[in-house]
């Protein structure tokens, strides 16, 4: 449902920031003292790569309407969609582009969501329709990951800009995006 | 399909530490929000903690906190869960669960087979 | 911590109608629960039929539906049958710690 809604019409690009939708204070527990002390996940290194100026993947912020079927989200949410070729950074353009300035002979890598967040969102539906709550994930980083043919053509096929679950604006969850992401799909929505 | 695959059961003595695995399969651990659950013999499910991607962080019940430990090895796709000062009432069938949407987080749609741990002098 | 509460037991004839119910402890229950509803069968691991109030899972069959009904997280199963009879388990969202019901023993009779 929400990935259809991605890539159908739940990318309406919005000019302003919209405020993240709240869920209410009673379910804002403290959780400090059930947190773990060291239960976060480490955070990705941005690239694989040990020369990080040579590579470049851009993080652009679109602000969009979840839907769900007939329904869409009270507010707007901003997330992040992943760009770039993640090859030397002197040979790619400066402006975001849709050609191949610079194809690497060796290993592919390419610009894909590293974390994730989650977000609460109310979604509003027609005809007097109950509201309903939903966690929506929404990328939160990209990085350069390194693909081999085997995950171009074979692991790659589920995700798409699907690429956004929910999460609210606390820390980021470093989510590893592991080779699932269908670049083919990745290029031509983002 | 998310699977998930729990080590066997275990056999402990009172005060003893227990260490339950679950290997994730058609995901990556790091793509999903790992939970879990016991249940002990006759009795209703229980919540002992798990990832919230809204903190960014594991949060553990308070009945279980200071006493458990939820690791996550990413090489190898395995969850960790670690329980310490084992008692004989912590006898239970232990479950790792987690989500498997691609676009709403949905908690504990898919479920391991569960882990039998007894504890017993 | 919150209590969540639901019948102990209830009885449905084959073919009928039932509504179990998941109370919490804080006050009413709302969307932002996030209510789950989960089947188990004996000796087999729980399974997830309802997230979110009242989002259906592929498998789960179109004769279970949830709602929120007086204040309470609800799963009305119509048109029961023998292999519905199990236990039946909500769990409420609260803000990022999770809270387990009773469970309710659904006899199918």
């Known amino acids: 449902q929400g990935w259809q809604a991605f890539k159908n019409d739940a990318t309406e690009i919005i000019p302003e920031l919209g405020e993240y939708p709240e869920p209410p204070p009673e379910l804002e527990n403290n959780k400090t003292m059930n947190r773990a002390e060291n239960g976060g996940r480490p955070p990705h290194h941005p690239f694989e790569t040990k020369d990080v100026s040579e590579y470049s993947c851009r993080e652009l912020h679109f602000t969009r309407y979840v839907t769900d079927g007939q329904c869409r989200s009270a507010k707007p949410v901003t997330e992040l969609v992943c760009s770039g070729q993640c090859g030397p950074a002197r040979l790619l353009p400066n402006a975001i582009g849709r050609g191949k300035w610079w194809r690497p002979s060796g290993p592919d890598f390419r610009c894909i969501p590293d974390r994730y967040r989650a977000q609460r969102v109310q979604l509003l539906c027609p005809g007097g329709a109950a509201p309903r709550a939903r966690k929506v994930r929404l990328v939160a980083s990209c990085k350069c990951k390194r693909l081999t043919r085997f995950h171009n053509q074979s692991e790659l096929k589920d995700f798409g800009p699907e690429a956004a679950r929910p999460q609210k604006g606390r820390k980021p969850r470093p989510r590893a995006r592991g080779a699932k992401a269908n670049q083919a799909e990745l290029e031509n929505a983002y | 399909e998310v699977q998930l695959v729990q080590s066997g059961a275990e056999v402990k003595k009172p005060g003893a530490s227990v260490k339950v695995s679950c290997k994730v399969s058609g995901y990556t651990l790091t793509e999903l929000s790992m939970h879990w659950v016991r249940q002990a013999p006759g009795k209703g499910l229980e919540w002992m903690g798990g990832f919230d991607p809204e903190a960014g962080e594991t949060i553990y019940a308070q009945k279980f906190q200071g006493r458990v430990t939820m690791t996550e090895d990413t090489s190898t796709d395995t969850a960790y869960m670690e329980l310490s000062s084992l008692r004989s009432e912590d006898t239970a069938v232990y479950y790792c669960?987690?989500?498997?949407?691609?676009?709403?987080?949905?908690?504990?749609?898919?479920w391991g087979q569960g882990t039998l741990v007894t504890v017993s002098s | 911590q919150a209590v969540v509460t639901q019948e102990p037991s209830l009885t449905v004839s084959p073919g009928g109608t039932v509504t179990l119910t998941c109370g919490s402890s804080t006050g009413a229950v709302t969307i932002w629960h996030y209510p789950y509803w989960f089947q188990q069968k004996p000796g087999q691991a729980p399974r997830t039929l309802i997230s979110?109030?009242?989002d259906k899972h592929s498998w789960t069959p179109a004769r279970f539906s949830g709602s929120l009904l007086g204040g309470k997280a609800a799963l009305t199963l119509s048109g029961a049958q023998p292999e519905d009879e199990a236990e039946y388990y909500c769990l409420l969202d609260y803000g990022g710690s999770f809270v387990f019901g009773g469970g309710t023993k659904l006899t199918v009779l």
């Open positions: 669960a987690t989500d498997g949407e691609l676009y709403w987080y949905k908690f504990f749609q898919h």
């Open positions: 979110d109030t009242n």
